[in-house]
């Protein structure tokens, strides 16, 4: 018996088609993805093959103005239209709190939303009961398939799930649910979840009875053969893990941003064992036409976005200096504003010993593309911020050793004076450079804001200590020559859309007046 699994993950509000790098579509003839194009391909496969499941492994929320404006209603609407069969909760589904998940998505979705390792307690338990499930048994042809969900247990550090949701260890939580499915005579089980490729592989290895793992969170691209676009495969598709009980378990993920549709064919025997598995992600390029009815619906929903772009978010009473003449040479107040917004967006009081889990921000000056003039009645709009941060990136959470940070700051000024983009703007960091010294030895003082303290203060950076840092995904991926970050990072979790972080901060503060205050000397 053959099952076709179609899967997406980490779509991050890419409802419209995008450019090849998943930023805003400029030249339509070369654009990719989007729900209209995805629907065309899904329908084509549904017509051609008998047993098809369409699954999403989480993080539909967060990433473009679509989410900023519609707050998840767009996810429910278009996933319903595409007739998804199931979705796992990702960390970003909690970005607007539990209410921001329940009302727009959980109550509106016509498909099951799953996570076995999230347990509700207190008053929330009854409120959320039945709105998400640990597993769901789906009829497919004359067979049944069990789908069991999981979510990163790091979610409390990455999003805003509140205090009434407990995120358990994935493997510990999954095993009893899979066992329950087995007692219900469900012998074909897919683990669908959002904890990253390493955890996906562990689940495949450790959870007895899981036949296939469909994952997300790490934006992992797997491919067998010659890849069709710019993404470099982390391994073959599917990636085969040998389980502790001697089975071959296929593990898949489909990169991110709706650029690909994962396509996996599984052959099951009478007892539900995987006899064979093969497939590849399908690149959703312009050779696949956009479905006209979905496209028309997108265009209808688009109207509200255009109106939103010009509405006032808040005011500034100072000039926001985002000029390259400032931000690529010295501390600039636009850099300070953005870094302050980045830290504010990551306030998570999850431990009494820590005022916050992260205190530091770094930001390449070259990523700041425009100033904002305060002489327009001080008004700041989304449109203004899109000029400052035009690349559609995210502000991510990484863990780095002190020694890596030191290398990053040396790189920041290794060719100082040439107006290059690698000059770092900071938050929660005091750095002193001596530019008379030779490149690679110019950082003379590097103090960082403590986290394990009740009164935050600056302490010298320790080379062997592991620090959490908020930075643009561009830097996490080694951009602007920061190869040491990419090579040496110990953990990387993707964060919120850059513009959204700053716009939320400005809306919250109402009036802003960032200063140049001696963070960089």
């Amino acid at each position: 018996w053959e099952l076709t699994i179609l899967h997406t993950n980490d779509v991050h509000s890419r409802l419209e088609q995008t450019s090849e790098d998943s930023s805003k579509c400029v030249n339509a003839s070369r654009c990719m993805g989007g729900v209209a194009r995805l629907f065309t391909k899904v329908q084509q496969i549904r017509r051609a093959e008998p047993n098809v499941l369409l699954l999403d492994a989480g993080d539909q929320y967060q990433g473009t103005i679509w989410f900023t404006v519609y707050k998840g209603a767009e996810v429910a609407h278009f996933m319903n239209a595409l007739r998804y069969d199931a979705m796992a909760l990702g960390n970003h589904e909690f970005d607007n709190g539990v209410e921001g998940l329940i009302e727009p998505l959980l109550k509106e979705a016509k498909f099951p939303i799953l996570s076995a390792n999230i347990k509700a307690k207190g008053p929330l338990a009854s409120q959320i009961s039945g709105l998400y499930l640990p597993y769901k048994v789906l009829p497919v042809g004359d067979e049944v398939v069990g789908i069991v969900g999981y979510t990163s247990k790091e979610t409390p550090f990455l999003s805003n799930p509140g205090t009434n949701l407990v995120f358990e260890d994935e493997i510990t939580a999954l095993q009893p649910e899979v066992d329950k499915l087995k007692t219900l005579n469900v012998n074909k089980i897919i683990a669908l979840g959002h904890s990253g490729f390493e955890m996906d592989k562990l689940i495949a290895q450790k959870v007895r009875g899981v036949d296939v793992v469909v994952g997300g969170h790490s934006n992992t691209f797997l491919y067998t053969g010659n890849p069709p676009s710019k993404e470099v495969p982390a391994g073959k598709y599917p990636f085969i893990v040998t389980s502790d009980d001697g089975r071959k378990v296929p593990v898949v993920q489909a990169y991110a941003f709706g650029k690909y549709l994962g396509y996996l064919k599984i052959e099951f025997d009478e007892r539900g064992n995987v006899i064979s598995s093969h497939g590849n992600p399908i690149l959703l390029n312009s050779s696949i036409p956009e479905d006209p009815s979905i496209k028309a619906d997108i265009n209808k929903w688009r109207i509200k976005l255009d109106n939103y772009s010009t509405q006032e978010l808040g005011k500034t009473i100072v000039y926001l200096d985002g000029s390259s003449q400032s931000c690529r040479f010295r501390e600039c107040n636009m850099g300070n504003l953005i870094c302050d917004a980045m830290i504010n967006n990551n306030l998570r009081h999850t431990d009494e010993m820590f005022w916050n889990h992260v205190s530091m921000c770094i930001l390449n000056g070259g990523g700041i593309r425009s100033p904002i003039d305060e002489r327009n009645n001080g008004t700041i709009t989304w449109e203004n911020l899109a000029a400052v941060l035009p690349f559609g990136g995210t502000f991510d959470l990484v863990q780095l050793k002190g020694s890596t940070l030191k290398k990053a700051f040396e790189h920041s000024v290794h060719r100082y004076g040439q107006s290059t983009g690698e000059f770092l703007q900071v938050g929660g960091i005091h750095v002193v450079y001596d530019l008379s010294r030779k490149p690679g030895d110019r950082v003379v003082k590097l103090d960082v804001l403590c986290t394990k303290c009740r009164v935050p203060s600056y302490d010298p950076l320790k080379m062997d200590e592991v620090y959490k840092v908020i930075l643009p995904n561009f830097l996490a991926n080694g951009g602007d020559g920061f190869q040491m970050i990419k090579d040496e990072l110990l953990r990387h979790d993707s964060g919120d859309q850059d513009i959204n972080v700053v716009s939320t901060y400005i809306s919250k503060m109402k009036v802003i007046y960032p200063a140049v205050e001696g963070r960089i000397k």
């Epitope: 042809g141 004359d142 071959k248 009478e270 064992n273």
Partner: antibody, heavy 113, light 106 residues
Framework: EVTLKESGPVLVKPTETLTLTCTVS????????IQWIRQPPGKLLEWLAV???????DYNAAFISRLTISKDTSKSQVVLTMTNMDPVDTATYYC???????WGQGTLVTVSS | DIQMTQSPSSLSASVGDRVTITCRAS??????LNWLQQKPGKAIKRLIY???SLDSGVPKRFSGSGSGTEYTLTISSLQPEDFATYYC????????FGGGTKVEIK
């Protein structure tokens, strides 16, 4: 639980037709095929025929003129008939799932006058 | 038709021994190979499917490997209950079996 059970006569006379039934539980014949295999006493396993989930069949070329396989999906039963039986057809006859994950206990059929 | 050549046809071994049985296919069968165990008066049992995956409840001392036309069943440390006849079965085309290997007590 996934199980298969063969039933049919234990003794048939030469030239007669053998009719064997395989009753399936735990999975659907609309999703999986059924194979028939035999093993003469002290000899090797020999594949006879298969009926696929869609209803089409394949036969061992050596027996194609003598074998017919059919199924009743609603009853979860597969029937194998073998015409013109001969003492050399004395064997244990097995039905098995399409992929061999599950086998019946087998039924010993003796061909003798 | 795909022919399966299994060797040896029989072997004598002691408890604790490592036992290896091989099957050669007349053409590439793309990992579509099972290993079966038959004991007198008992139902035939599949041990390994798709060349190397272990069936539920089968001890880890059994392992399968191979690709293309060459396949191997290994019992890492023979136990008293392992004395039986073993068959390879290809399902890439119409089923064909190897000739069987009878594992006897030395």
């Amino acid at each position: 639980e996934v199980t298969l059970k063969e039933s049919g006569p234990v003794l048939v006379k030469p030239t007669e037709t053998l009719t064997l039934t395989c009753t399936v539980s735990g999975f659907s014949l609309s999703s999986y095929g059924i194979q028939w295999i035999r093993q003469p006493p002290g000899k090797l396993l020999e594949w006879l025929a298969v009926i696929w989930s869609g209803g089409s069949a394949d036969y061992n070329a050596a027996f194609i003129s003598r074998l017919t396989i059919s199924k009743d999906t609603s009853k979860s039963q597969v029937v194998l008939t073998m015409t013109n039986m001969d003492p050399v057809d004395t064997a244990t006859y097995y039905c098995a799932g399409q992929y061999g994950s599950v086998w019946g206990q087998g039924t010993l059929v003796t061909v003798s006058s | 038709d795909i022919q399966m050549t299994q060797s040896p046809s029989s072997l004598s071994a002691s408890v604790g021994d490592r036992v290896t049985i091989t099957c050669r296919a007349s053409q590439d069968i793309g990992d579509r190979l099972n290993w079966l165990q038959q004991k007198p008066g008992k139902a035939i049992k599949r041990l390994i499917y798709a060349t190397s995956s272990l069936d539920s409840g089968v001890p880890k001392r059994f392992s399968g490997s191979g690709s293309g036309t060459e396949y191997t069943l290994t019992i890492s440390s023979l136990q008293p209950e392992d004395f039986a006849t073993y068959y390879c079965l290809q399902y890439a085309g119409s089923w064909t079996f190897g000739g069987g290997t009878k594992v006897e007590i030395k």
